[in-house]
Interface confidence: low
Amino acid sequence: DSSKWVFEHPETLYAWEGACVWIPCTYRALDGDLESFILFHNPEYNKNTSKFDGTRLYESTKDGKVPSEQKRVQFLGDKNKNCTLSIHPVHLNDSGQLGLRMESKTEKWMERIHLNVSERPFPPHIQLPPEIQESQEVTLTCLLNFSCYGYPIQLQWLLEGVPMRQAAVTSTSLTIKSVFTRSELKFSPQWSHHGKIVTCQLQDADGKFLSNDTVQLNVKHTPKLEIKVTPSDAIVREGDSVTMTCEVSSSNPEYTTVSWLKDGTSLKKQNTFTLNLREVTKDQSGKYCCQVSNDVGPGRSEEVFLQVQYAPEPSTVQILHSPAVEGSQVEFLCMSLANPLPTNYTWYHNGKEMQGRTEEKVHIPKILPWHAGTYSCVAENILGTGQRGPGAELDVQYPPKKVTTVIQNPMPIREGDTVTLSCNYNSSNPSVTRYEWKPHGAWEEPSLGVLKIQNVGWDNTTIACAACNSWCSWASPVALNVQYAPRDVRVRKIKPLSEIHSGNSVSLQCDFSSSHPKEVQFFWEKNGRLLGKESQLNFDSISPEDAGSYSCWVNNSIGQTASKAWTLEVLYAPRRLRVSMSPGDQVMEGKSATLTCESDANPPVSHYTWFDWNNQSLPYHSQKLRLEPVKVQHSGAYWCQGTNSVGKGRSPLSTLTVYYSPETIGRR
């Protein structure tokens, strides 16, 4: 309606004597700014005067000043939209209606606000959810329709008079819509909180009590149970009787059904609060509890562990592990159902009692073949001794033992023989399935564990065999000790270290690399002629005639071996020089004559020199001296000299006679 002033504020405000009131307020005038404001207490309209009568709590002045008696009431608004008020302190007789008389230039308005001031602080109000269940988080709310900036308060939660340790969240509202203080507490109630008193306490800033509200918690929960057993330790012997009683300590709402469970499974036809077990058997040992249900759900008691004691049952043996490998560790476990647990054990190996073994487990740190066999045990507790069960078999596996390589041939073995060896062993578990031989060769295995070496080599020194099951055991190698003729026979010159010159002292050595047997004989030969029987052949003064092809032989009882032929070369200066003439030593003038210097030398002559009868050297240095045409004055004695790397040699004189031709004689 456009003819009205528009106000917004809480309809009623609440406070108590000595507190304060804060009135949030907004307005919109019909025209222009506010020119006059009066706050009435319980205003009454006077028709005669056309004015409002009543106590004036506040009045605005032309200069905006507030008289000192008006300090208790404050107008905190402005001239166009805010009409907030504060009364501090507020008194009991302030209760009633507050009238806000507003005047603008042309319009007037009276706005009414209710104020409810009580003599004492009024209590807050606790709000609970419609249903509370154990262990489910709920929010408890404490609401107070009061808040004022000038009067701080606090709300505290108590459980059975004791402050609650959960943190509460307090919020305040001072708005045109609502004025309140609220505290919210998140809380997970347990069944034990059922029926307990929760208090929300209003306190001033100093923690002084002002007022409170209380509620009794109604916590829905499953039945809470206690189980009692006779005998109290729940330990009995077979044939005894046992009574269990289920007591409900709390249930909200009331319980509806009862049942009993053993090891989590419901016992049929047991729906009362007492469970009677008569003449119990060992099968009735287990964990018992009672279960009682209500609308929330089932509740279970703690478990009672009923132990029905009995003597050990026939025992069985568990072996970790069989088959066992020799040298490994093995553990035997005696398993026998008994209550109480067995305190003593007796162990048997192949029916014979094992001394000093009284524990549930027998540990053998290093298994040997003799540990194999049947193991059984007997368990004993306070109620008696059990029977010996069937036992368990321990199989001890091990590599083949005492493996040997045996030579089947008569000794000695000669190079080229056929050798047969066998691989023998003492015992094995599991059985030997194959054999191996070292070194590897292209050898024949005619049957399992037998090796045949055809045409045995001189260098076949040792052979080893292995007998194999799951593992291989190697025998010590055996020496074949193959006998053979001397090997790698050769001639070696010991001296001189350099080339051999005529007249040198010369030694030749007959070498060989190996021989089995070691006892040998030596033979030297040249051109099929035996020269000596020592390992060395010596020449005190070598001559060119000693040159030639030499061989040495070495023999033992197996055979004889010759070296390659070795050539002995003797170096010497030219010797046996002579001058030969062609066609002869008498030649007719005008013909040709050829003189040849013949010699024996090693190395061959490298340089020739010719001399005449006057010992004059001629300017010719080849082996042949050719005179053509020959002249009478060429007649005379000639000789030659030959030179090699060793030395020189000269020939005796040879005479050339040149005679006149018939023509020359005819002219004379």
Partner: nanobody
């Protein structure tokens, strides 16, 4: 004839890890054992660990708890996972092969160098 090829060696700081591999080829015996030996300069060859094709494993006291030996029989490959390495683990590591579970190691690899720096 069995050929063995090692790999995975190298330089690592003390406390670090390495994984050695050894690939075998030419093997014919179904039950065999592969092992690791090592040789530090100036020392004799020292046994490290062994693993047979049927699952048996064994370790030298000096490496037990730090080294783990394993085998992939399908790939004919052996591995040595070396953790918490120490300077004294520095050596040439050799892979070996032999028949049976308690093998006589007939074949040896060329070796791979492992150096642990402090």
């Amino acid at each position: 004839q069995v050929q063995l090829v090692e790999s995975g060696g190298g330089l690592v700081q003390a406390g670090g890890s390495l994984r050695l591999s050894c690939a075998a080829s030419g093997s014919t015996f179904s039950l065999n054992t592969m092992a690791w030996y090592r040789q530090a300069p100036g020392n004799q060859r020292e046994y490290v660990a062994a693993a047979s094709s049927d699952g048996y494993t064994n370790y030298a006291d000096s490496v037990r708890g730090r080294f783990t030996i394993s085998r992939d029989n399908d790939k004919n490959t052996m591995y040595l996972q070396m953790n918490s390495l120490r300077p004294e683990d520095t050596a040439v590591y050799y892979c070996t092969w032999g028949t049976g579970r308690f093998a006589d190691y007939i074949y040896w690899g060329q070796g791979t160098q492992v150096t642990v720096s402090s």
